[in-house]
């Protein structure tokens, strides 16, 4: 069922269908007894009340108040009283835009993100019944989409996607042809939430090693998901058999990042594997970040200071 | 312009074979080591499987060696990966981008599904 108007100031456009719904309606059906009555005061007119003869343009049902269709002279305040139960509604009728398929103040504005996920439903549930069709503009020119009762758009946002979105919905009441018309101003920005991709730990790292041994080196980042997390070595061991790159690992952290974890595992170490830089690149859009392992005989480490060595 | 476009990509029963190519442009494209990389099924990243160095050396995970061949056309600005001997853990889409270097924006990559 169609939520009860709760905002006290409404703006609506000359023209188009609009209703009032009170929110005490589950109980009204309760009480069907009870008198219900809706009012309006503009200026000098105090609570008037309506009913269908105030206008040929008004509807009352149980919950409702509809206007078919709503005109500028309707902007004023409405009440709906009902035993001890009030609510009341200031309403602001605006001009339409002559010169446009929508009225700038009665725009929505979302903000998306490039390559996030961004869709327009076009969707009357109140009206719903009514409607024999319904058409997605985009500044004012109609999209070709398949479904002509809820238009839709789905997709990853493209900086081309930026504009007016305005669902019409199209919909005859007493042999009369309206149309109601919701807007969506649709900026797209360029993703805010990347974080620049950082390795963890020291950028050098000597590891102690004994010849015929294994090693694991292993290597973390917290990246974005496009980035992108890889081992680099000397083109003289790019074929070493000895040489095998893991899986990689990635947990999403709580703030939507994520931690990535890729291991080099060395066998059989040999010579040719001492003090040649194994390095492990972090890459994304923004740039590259590099930590470098260095394989040292155990033999040697005497040589290497304290803060630089890695067991 | 979209830098980096993928294809050849398709269904392929086990045992199958497959190349996919990777047209780039908008950078010096003999100048960069280039790269193809796997995003598999439920996974929301992508993994390096081969590289190719800008004079050629060549470099490939264990799970794709001696299946997988990269090789690059410079005068093409393309880089072609030969998949033979496919398994259904290939099953992925993939995409090609540079390797060493800061990252292009990511093409639409190419879906390679095999079947048993």
């Known amino acids: 069922a169609e939520s009860c108007t709760s905002r006290p100031h409404i703006t609506v456009v000359e023209g188009e269908p609009f209703y009032l719904k009170h929110c005490s309606c589950s109980l009204a059906h309760e009480i069907e007894t009870t008198t219900k009555s809706w009012y309006k005061s503009s200026g000098s007119q105090e609570h008037v009340e309506l009913n269908p003869r105030s206008s040929s343009r008004i509807a009352l049902h149980d919950c409702v108040l509809e206007f078919w269709p709503v005109e500028l002279n309707d902007t004023g305040s409405y009440f709906f009283q009902m035993k001890n139960y009030t609510q009341k509604w200031k309403l602001n009728v605006i001009r339409r835009n002559k010169h446009s398929c929508f009225t700038e103040r009665q725009v929505t504005s979302k903000i998306v993100e490039v390559k996030k996920f961004f869709q327009i439903t076009c969707e009357n549930s109140y009206y719903q019944t009514l409607v024999n069709s319904t058409s997605l503009y985009k500044n004012c020119k109609k999209l070709l989409l398949e479904n002509n009762k809820n238009p839709t758009i789905k997709k990853n946002a493209e900086f081309e996607d930026q504009g007016y979105y305005s669902c019409v919905h199209f919909l005859h009441h007493n042999g009369k042809l309206f149309n109601i018309t919701k807007t969506f101003n649709i900026t797209i920005v360029e993703d805010r939430s990347n974080i620049v991709p950082v390795l963890l730990g020291p950028k050098l790292n000597h590891v102690a090693v004994e010849l015929g041994k294994n090693v694991r080196l292993n290597c973390s980042a917290l990246l974005n998901e496009e980035d992108v997390i890889y081992w680099m070595f000397g083109e003289e061991n790019g074929s070493d058999p000895n040489i095998h790159e893991e899986k990689e690992m990635r947990i999403m952290t709580p703030e939507g990042k994520w931690h990535a974890s890729k291991v080099l595992r060395i066998e059989n170490i040999g010579e040719s594997n001492l003090n040649v830089l194994y390095n492990c690149t972090v890459a994304s859009t923004g740039g590259t970040d590099t930590k470098s392992f260095i394989l040292v005989r155990k033999a040697d480490m005497a040589d290497i200071p304290g803060h630089v060595f890695t067991r | 312009d979209v830098p980096l476009q993928e294809s050849g990509g398709g269904l392929v029963q086990t045992g199958g074979s497959l190349r996919l190519s990777c047209a780039a442009s908008?950078?010096?494209?003999?100048?960069?080591?280039m790269g193809w990389y796997q995003q598999a099924p439920g996974k929301k990243y992508r993994e390096l499987v081969a590289?190719?160095?800008?004079?050629?050396?060549?470099r490939y995970i264990d799970s794709v060696k001696g299946r997988f061949t990269i090789s690059r056309d410079n005068a093409k600005n393309t880089v072609y990966l030969q998949m033979n001997s496919l398994k259904p853990e290939d099953t992925a889409v993939y995409y090609c981008?540079?390797?060493?270097?800061?990252?292009?924006?990511w093409g639409q990559g190419t879906q390679v599904t095999v079947s048993s």
């Open positions: 908008g950078f010096t494209f003999n100048s960069y080591a």
């Open positions: 981008n540079v390797y060493g270097a800061t990252l292009r924006s």
């Open positions: 590289h190719i160095g800008s004079g050629g050396s060549t």
